[in-house]
């Protein structure tokens, strides 16, 4: 179980690196973030560490109310602050693992 979670964490972070470069990856991550109401791997600040992402933005899928451009110059109160690895991991533990 721990190995699966560790793999999921590494994979999620790898996909984050590809987010700005790959539309397919972006759409998968957007779906996960929107569906699980989460943002980033550990939390939303992970997006700040992606070199090709603008420092003041997160994907729009992180927003509580998703609209085009809502992740630009974001306010913390307007986005999901919980990380996706923990949130999706909890769902996986409960339903799959």
């Amino acid at each position: 179980r721990d190995k699966v979670m560790s793999e999921f964490n590494n994979n999620f972070r790898q996909q984050m690196e590809n987010y700005p470069k790959n539309n397919h990856t972006a759409s998968i991550l957007d779906r996960m973030q929107a569906d699980f109401k989460c943002c980033g791997a550990a939390n939303y600040t992970d997006w700040e560490k992606i070199p090709s992402m603008s420092k003041n933005r997160v994907p729009d899928s992180c927003c509580i109310n998703v609209t085009v451009g809502c992740g630009i110059n974001f306010n913390e109160k307007a986005i999901h602050k919980e990380g996706c690895v923990e949130k999706i991991g909890g769902w996986l533990r409960k339903n799959v693992l």
Partner: antibody
Framework: QVQLVESGGGLVKPGGSLRLSCAAS????????MNWIRQAPGKGLEWVSY????????YYADSVKGRFTISRDNAKASLYLQMSSLKAEDTAVYYC????????????WGQGTTVTVSS | DIQMTQSPSSLSASVGDRVTITCRAS??????LNWYQQKPGKAPKLLIY???SLQSGVPSRFSGSGSGTDFTLTISSLQPEDFATYYC??????????FGQGTRLEIK
């Protein structure tokens, strides 16, 4: 009413330190990013630093990086700017500024506090 | 970093005149453009946000337009209290938050 009140400015020698404070009232402090913006005598506005709602994200202008530290105490609804290794070019009025972020502008400014760096 | 360039840097006008100040961004900033007014010895005051939205309490003679790289602030009929310095500011790509150099509006 919504208010930001700065304090802590004064005259300091080059190389010295100073700590600016900003007391917020009349609004939910944790709903906002906060900025320090300065204005040198007779000059335009220059952004210095910002800090996110929770304090998780903070950034600095290149001109102050490594010398200034921004922080906030949400329990006290207060913003701070610790300034060290001060230079003559840091002489300015320093404004504490509320920032709703997204596409909204910086909507509430303090009255400013004057920092003079001179020997 | 995104540079903001205002023109003119100073402007003389009379009460009742229609005045336009322009601001140009070095790259597209969508509509993430704000305008501020500053009077001598006072803190700046937000006039316009999101390029064209009037901040609460600001008189309707002030208006903003533009998107992408080119923006304008228009004062339809100058009043004595409008003589001040005006700044544009972008919030599309930060840090850093960048301002124009300012436009000083003086009485002719």
């Amino acid at each position: 009413q919504v208010q930001l009140v700065e304090s802590g400015g004064g005259l300091v020698k080059p190389g010295g330190s100073l700590r600016l404070s900003c007391a917020a009232s009349g609004f939910i402090f944790t709903d906002y990013f906060m900025n320090w913006i300065r204005q040198a005598p007779g000059k335009g506005l220059e952004w210095v630093s910002y800090i996110s709602n929770s304090g998780n994200i903070l950034y600095y202008a290149d001109s102050v990086k490594g010398r200034f530290t921004i922080s906030r105490d949400n329990a006290k609804a207060s913003l701070y700017l610790q300034m060290s290794s001060l230079k003559a070019e840091d002489t300015a009025v320093y404004y504490c500024v509320r920032d709703p972020r997204m596409f909204y502008g910086m909507d509430v400014w303090g009255q400013g506090t004057t920092v003079t760096v001179s020997s | 970093d995104i540079q903001m360039t205002q023109s003119p840097s100073s402007l003389s006008a009379s009460v009742g005149d229609r005045v336009t100040i322009t601001c140009r961004a070095s790259q597209s900033i969508s509509s993430y453009l704000n305008w501020y007014q500053q009077k001598p010895g006072k803190a700046p005051k937000l006039l316009i946000y999101a390029a064209s939205s009037l901040q609460s309490g600001v008189p309707s003679r002030f208006s903003g337009s533009g998107s992408g790289t080119d923006f304008t602030l228009t004062i339809s009929s100058l009043q004595p209290e409008d003589f001040a310095t005006y700044y544009c500011q972008q919030s599309y790509s930060t840090p850093p938050i960048t301002f124009g150099q300012g436009t000083r509006l003086e009485i002719k």
